[in-house]
């Protein structure tokens, strides 16, 4: 139940490009530590939850109208890029930096 | 069911400071259009969903491991400030700009 669910936080997740079916065009790396955010954004939102002012307001509105307004959601607040070596459509080898691939921190939004 | 739920988008929400119990310290405004984000971040994430690269990856991992990794969540991508006139602890009247109070746009994160 949501009462027992842990508070919003970063969880470790390694993503294999083979599992995603991308192994034929991504040369390197074979995968990466993507991580993800999960957990409850429940009242009261404490400092660890990196909550925006809007999230604080939304939490209060949710308490008064849970059927209509959801709790804020647990989402990335800091994301990092990774460099990927891949084949383009013309079979050229390209090194490209992909933004917003790795979750560094999570918060209530 | 999640299949029937609309895609991630901005929903209108007017918040009354009286409803929040803040009427004794907030002089003006009486309330504001806070809005909120809600809806599904389901595969495939289209351009309207303002999805990060991480959200695209997480959507695929969720489909393969729904028990372990949640769908990305629908969260604000653009927030605006509002100016608030209020009494401080010493009963002084203060005009202050509060950041991240109004949802302007939503996306999958």
């Amino acid at each position: 139940s949501s009462e027992l669910k842990t508070a919003c936080k970063k969880h470790e997740l390694y993503v294999s490009f083979q599992d995603l079916g991308w192994q034929d065009w991504i040369i390197a790396p074979k995968g990466y530590a993507a991580n993800y955010c999960d957990g409850e954004c429940s009242f009261p939102l404490n400092a660890h939850m990196n909550a925006t002012n809007h999230a604080i307001v939304q939490t209060l509105v949710h308490l008064m109208n849970p059927e209509y307004v959801p709790k804020p959601c647990c989402a990335p607040t800091k994301l990092n890029a990774i460099s990927v070596l891949y084949f383009d459509d013309n079979s050229n080898v390209i090194l490209k930096k992909y933004r917003n691939m790795v979750v560094r921190a999570c918060g209530c939004h | 069911s999640s299949e029937l739920k609309t895609a991630c988008k901005k929903h209108e929400l007017y918040v009354s400071f009286q409803d929040l119990g803040w009427q004794d310290w907030i002089i003006a405004p009486k309330g504001y259009a806070a809005n909120y984000c809600d809806g599904e971040c389901s595969f495939p994430l289209n351009a309207h969903m303002n999805a990060t690269n991480h959200a695209i990856v997480q959507t695929l991992v969720h489909l393969m491991n729904p028990e372990y990794v949640p769908k990305p969540c629908c969260a604000p991508t653009k927030l605006n400030a509002i100016s608030v006139l209020y009494f401080d602890d010493n009963s002084n009247v203060i005009l202050k700009k509060y950041r991240n109070m109004v949802v302007r746009a939503c996306g999958c994160h």
Epitope: S1, L4, K5, T6, S16, D19, L20, G21, D38 | F43, H62, L63, M64, N65, P66, E67, Y68, P70
Partner: antibody
Framework: QVQLVQSGAEVKKPGSSVKVSCKAS????????MHWVRQAPGQGLEWMGY????????KYNENFKGRVTITADESTSTAYMELSSLRSEDTAVYYC???????????WGQGTLVTVSS | DIQMTQSPSSLSASVGDRVTITCRSS??????LAWYQQKPGKAPKLLIY???NLADGVPSRFSGSGSGTDFTLTISSLQPEDFATYYC?????????FGGGTKVEIK
């Protein structure tokens, strides 16, 4: 060794409920999702739903229209599947099955026969 | 919901035969398919996961191939203990759906 042991066979009246248990041993219960699958006599396999005992996250097959509830008790490493408003078509063998991340249902319980008859 | 269609629904074969069972998904599920074997009165047993990966303890005569919407389970040389019913399962969101099954009988 890793195993799932289910409760014994049940005979139930139409309209009543049944609760089947599945006791896990030989692994960390909260590290793996537990699924429930049923099989009517002479028929194929039908997925009912799952629970992740780590966070009590559940998901159900909508074919059961809110009649199924899956729970887990970490203290006894036991998962439960309760099916309410039973009808004769619910007569089936009910299986619990573990599914690791990135894998399929690798360990299954022995099955529990539930017979619904007036 | 994704539909999984297995064919044939039944087949007769002899010991030593090469047997092929196919499974088609109504949507692209990439490599997210499993195969199970079930004998009468027993629980299903995992044979193949992620379309091609052999589960622990499964003999090498079993192999899986395919990706996207079309998948195949092959038994290279049928053994007496292989007479059973085989199910495919798509693992792509929920509900997790099974194929209708293929019964492999002795000719």
């Amino acid at each position: 060794q890793v195993q799932l042991v289910q409760s014994g066979a049940e005979v139930k009246k139409p309209g009543s409920s049944v609760k089947v248990s599945c006791k896990a041993s030989g692994y960390t219960f909260t590290s793996y999702a537990m699924h429930w699958v049923r099989q009517a006599p002479g028929q194929g396999l039908e997925w009912m739903g799952y629970i992740n005992p780590y966070n009590d996250g559940t998901k159900y097959n909508e074919n059961f229209k809110g009649r199924v509830t899956i729970t887990a008790d970490e203290s006894t490493s036991t998962a439960y599947m309760e099916l309410s408003s039973l009808r004769s078509e619910d007569t089936a063998v009910y299986y619990c099955a573990r599914r690791p991340f990135g894998n399929a249902m690798d360990i299954w319980g022995q099955g529990t026969l539930v017979t619904v008859s007036s | 919901d994704i539909q999984m269609t297995q064919s044939p629904s039944s087949l007769s074969a002899s010991v030593g035969d090469r047997v092929t069972i196919t499974c088609r998904s109504s949507e692209n599920i990439y490599r997210n398919l499993a195969w199970y074997q079930q004998k009468p009165g027993k629980a299903p047993k995992l044979l193949i996961y992620a379309a091609t990966n052999l589960a622990d303890g499964v003999p090498s005569r079993f192999s899986g191939s395919g990706s996207g919407t079309d998948f195949t389970l092959t038994i290279s040389s049928l053994q007496p203990e292989d007479f059973a019913t085989y199910y495919c399962q798509g693992i792509w969101g929920t509900p997790l759906t099974f194929g209708g099954g293929t019964k492999v009988e002795i000719k």
